[in-house]
């Protein structure tokens, strides 16, 4: 708390402007008036007061908005967004979105912080899903955002905003969100023809089915390895050899150099032998010939 | 690539007074806030103010004010330093500095320096 | 003005070692501090910021923690262009104000 004193005769602020970078900070708690300083908030991002003065103002406006800021108000921190806590944000209710890019704008280039996260969880709360707008501001400024989601938060997520993904925004995604988000992604792409919706799939592919692996394998669309790499290995595992030769084209001979990692090293060790030689890459570690093989797991299903 | 070039050492007598030029980037030239900050030798490093050119402030420590001048020639994109009344211990080597970002901001640490000006006063 | 100290003022230590330098305010400052390096003859060089943040090309050995007064800067592994003076400074409050200094030195 700053102690209350008079206000030094002659300095009262009349308005906000860079005459108050001088004030010391028991001034510019006394001199400048927290309704006046809510009124010109649109300057106090023009002057270049230290974060000791930035302090100072934000007691001012709590001071003047207990229960939280309005939004005329908040859309004009700059700066001063630096000095809220996640709790100070939580009374918040945030409707624009330009308000919240001007705020993001601010943290611009950091990572994202607590009080960015809660700001953010505010916002898409109050709009009840993340629409294609505020996906597209969001990954903007945070590629990895997506990402950050559980896949519970990700279900909200409509499929028409899935056009606003890209690649990039996917680089961090685990399987489970990656599970929620294919769906989505193979009914906002479903009117394109091949080519084009392979290009748009291809980077959510992380959880594809093996159905959806297969009938892919049937469109010549020459997957690379670094695709292929990302898929799940429980659809992986029932592609046979020709089916995966098909689905990789030209790339296929990239699985030399992988086979001792997942999934191509699981997906070795389901196929024949006799079948993995057709490839010509020297694959070893398939079933050999002759031997007969069980599916255990149907088995324990039945008992 | 943000740039600062400051001019060339100095030898000054006592009671004279010196003038340190400081030529940045032309692209945020106006809107960055240049800092001085000197060094004694085998001292720390002190800071003497700074100057926003866009919003021709200047703001002063208490130590040199009334001695230390700073002003902005936008024309040449060059902020300059005076120091007058130079006494010995004002030998030091002086440097200008730049805060980040493209536009002012309450973070005043330095990512950008000068190569520093030595000022040698000596009678 | 606020006051920044810092400890130990020198230091001796190996290539491959861990080593922790302290700086103090005299009052708190809000993870407003930055970390810098000098070698002789040459200008300062940014490590670190907001106490914690790691200026972009600055190995990932070099990192900040602390909060209030209290910061710490540490090297994770020593390496031999590491030998230098470091410096912290508050940007909290003007005058913006430095420490005096911690000069690491090769055992």
């Known amino acids: 708390e700053v102690e209350k004193t008079a206000c030094p005769s002659g300095k009262k602020a009349r308005e906000i402007d860079e005459s108050l970078i001088f004030y010391k900070k028991w001034e510019l708690e006394a001199c400048v008036d927290a309704a006046l300083l809510a009124t010109q908030m649109d300057r106090v991002n023009a002057i270049p007061f230290t974060y000791e003065q930035l302090d100072v103002l934000k007691h001012k406006l709590d001071e003047l908005y207990p229960q939280g800021y309005p939004e005329s108000v908040i859309q004009h921190l700059g700066y001063l967004f630096l000095k809220m806590s996640p709790e100070d944000i939580r009374k918040w209710n945030v409707t624009s979105l330009e308000t919240l890019k001007a705020l993001l704008e601010v943290n611009k280039g950091h990572e994202m912080s607590p009080q960015v996260a809660t700001l953010i969880d505010r916002f898409v709360k109050g709009r009840g899903q993340l629409d294609k707008d505020t996906l597209d501001t969001l990954t903007a400024f945070y590629p990895g955002y997506l990402c950050s989601l559980s896949p519970e938060e990700l279900s909200s997520v409509p499929p028409s905003s899935i056009w606003a993904v890209r690649p990039q925004d996917l680089d961090t995604c685990d399987p489970r969100q990656l599970d929620v988000l294919y769906p989505k992604a193979r009914l906002a792409f479903q009117n394109m023809n091949g080519s084009e919706y392979f290009v748009k799939i291809q980077s959510f592919l992380g959880g594809a089915p093996t159905e959806d692996l297969k009938a892919l394998s049937q469109q010549n669309v020459s997957m690379d390895l670094a695709t292929f790499m990302k898929l799940r290995t429980d659809a992986v595992l029932p592609l046979t050899v020709a089916e995966v030769q098909k689905l990789l084209g030209p790339h296929v001979e990239g699985l030399k150099a992988e086979e001792r990692h997942r999934p191509v090293r699981d997906w070795i060790l389901r196929q024949r032998q006799d079948d993995l030689d057709t490839l010509g890459l020297g694959l070893q570690g398939g079933i050999p010939n002759g031997y007969l093989v069980l599916d255990l797991s149907m088995q324990e299903a039945l008992s | 690539q943000v740039q600062l070039v400051q001019s060339g050492a100095e030898v000054k007598k006592p009671g004279s007074s010196v003038k340190v030029s400081c030529k940045t980037s032309?692209?945020?030239?106006?809107?960055?806030?240049i800092n001085w900050v000197r060094q004694a030798p085998g001292h720390g490093l002190e800071w003497m103010g700074r100057?926003?050119?866009?919003?021709?402030?200047?703001d002063y420590a208490q130590e040199f004010q009334g001695r230390v001048t700073f002003t902005a020639d936008e024309s040449t994109n060059t902020v300059y330093m005076q120091l007058t009344s130079l006494r010995s211990e004002d030998t030091a080597v002086y440097y200008c500095?730049?805060?980040?970002?493209?536009?002012?901001?309450?973070?005043?640490?330095?990512?950008?320096w000068g190569q520093g000006t030595l000022v040698t006063v000596s009678s | 003005a606020i006051r920044m100290t810092q400890s130990p003022s020198s230091l001796s230590a190996s290539v491959g070692d861990r080593v922790t330098i302290t700086c103090r305010a005299s009052?708190?400052?809000?993870?407003?501090l930055a970390w810098y390096q000098q070698k002789p003859g040459k200008a300062p060089k940014l490590l670190l910021y907001?106490?914690?943040r790691l200026e972009s090309g600055v190995p990932s050995r070099f990192s900040g923690s602390g909060s209030g007064t209290d910061y710490t800067l540490t090297i994770s592994s020593l390496q031999p262009e590491d030998f230098a003076t470091y410096y912290c400074?508050?940007?909290?409050?003007?005058?913006?104000?430095f420490g005096p200094g911690t000069k690491l030195e090769i055992k």
């Open positions: 500095a730049r805060d980040p970002g493209s536009t002012w901001s309450p973070n005043q640490f330095f990512p950008h």
């Open positions: 032309a692209d945020t030239f106006s809107a960055n806030t």
């Open positions: 100057i926003i050119p866009s919003l021709n402030i200047r």
């Open positions: 009052q708190g400052i809000s993870n407003s």
């Open positions: 907001a106490a914690s």
């Open positions: 400074q508050q940007y909290y409050s003007t005058p913006f104000t």
